[in-house]
Amino acid sequence: SQPQAVPPYASENQTCRDQEKEYYEPQHRICCSRCPPGTYVSAKCSRIRDTVCATCAENSYNEHWNYLTICQLCRPCDPVMGLEEIAPCTSKRKTQCRCQPGMFCAAWALECTHCELLSDCPPGTEAELKDEVGKGNNHCVPCKAGHFQNTSSPSARCQPHTRCENQGLVEAAPGTAQSDTTCKNPLEPLPPEMSGTMLM
């Protein structure tokens, strides 16, 4: 069997054996080693010498196998843009940011660049649960049967109606999507001006 090519090696078809860890260098028409994550090219390859890599300095990173001659500068999560840090920058990974609580990503360019406040869901609705927090604005959906939500809020959840009988009371007024059931003491009539949820 043919011996495995070790960089640098000639490539006539401009492709390299290991696309992830090697790259085609057109000036010399050879395949050279890429630098692993967390490093950069300190010495470029030639026909007789392979790439030499060096570790990224503090506060800089390269995330992938690369042939970059510099490392990328770590950037903080910008609170003015509504972002907060969830993981610090390392030599192999940029700072991980997310939208602050109560915000969603309004501008996306490979990563979130700008967050905005989530819209309120009106009474009788709640925000549809998403797979990923902060990914999009609220989509308000009606409370399901037997539940209510009585505020304008981006995060309030629909709650189940109170079951009067569980408290030894009787229903004075049924719950709606926007209000809870009104309960009363079974021995007392409900005065018309009373609007409390529960009368003792």
Partner: antibody, heavy 120, light 107 residues
């Protein structure tokens, strides 16, 4: 202007070890260059021995590889050559040189050379 | 290893002469060829690389050409300071190798 200066014993006994140092001035050994050793037996042609990068990466001439060690000392801005088990055939003028990385691998700066004689 | 040969091994010429030195590689080396000048008791000096780029500070009377296996160093008008030995060097594959040299002396 980069300057290179070889130093070391001019006489080495057969089967002994030849040791030379090259001091780099007018530039940093930590720059993007390879630091090389080339020798020239009296009245003959040039032979590349090997070279080193400042991180310690080395390349050696296969014909000498088993006997050669090149090392670097960044704190002193110098690099060194050790050639073991020497014979009279290793008598030569030894040059240190610089080769910029990523080029067509030419040697653009040379030391003045030092003659090393292998004799008992 | 790639073998490098040079011709002639020596030549005698006069000041003002046009001089050609040939270097041949044992296999194709594309354009990976460099030329050096060496004077007695001195280190080699880079003249030309890859194989027609003039090194900084080298007079324009020196020129180089060729590709593949055959290369030429030309001195258009020989000057007194040009009497020396000239070496070619390939850097196409490891190890880099040098030609045996061409000595240019005064006629």
């Amino acid at each position: 202007q980069v300057q290179l200066q070889e130093s070391g014993p001019g006489l080495v006994k057969p089967s002994g070890t030849l040791s030379l140092t090259c001091a780099v001035s007018g530039g940093s050994i930590s720059s993007s260059n390879w630091w090389s050793w080339v020798r020239q037996p009296p009245g003959k042609g040039l032979e590349w021995i090997g070279d080193i990068y400042h991180d310690g990466t080395t390349y050696y001439n296969p014909s000498l590889k088993s006997r050669v060690t090149v090392s670097v000392d960044k704190s002193k801005n110098q690099f060194s050559l050790k050639l073991s088990s020497v014979t009279a055939a290793d008598t030569a003028v030894y040059y240190c040189a610089r080769s910029p990385s990523g080029t067509t691998d030419y040697f653009d700066y040379w030391g003045q050379g030092t003659l090393v004689t292998v004799s008992s | 290893d790639i073998q490098m040969t040079q011709s002639p091994s020596s030549l005698s010429a006069s000041v003002g002469d046009r001089v050609n030195i040939t270097c041949r590689a044992s296999q194709s080396i594309s354009s990976y060829l460099n030329w050096y000048q060496q004077k007695p008791g001195k280190a080699p000096k880079l003249l030309i690389y890859a194989p027609s780029s003039l090194q900084s500070g080298v007079p324009s009377r020196f020129s180089g050409g060729g590709s593949g296996t055959d290369f030429t160093l030309t001195i258009s008008s020989l000057q007194p300071e040009d009497f020396a030995t000239y070496f070619c060097q390939q850097s196409y594959s490891t190890p880099p190798t040098f030609g045996p040299g061409t000595k240019v002396d005064i006629k």
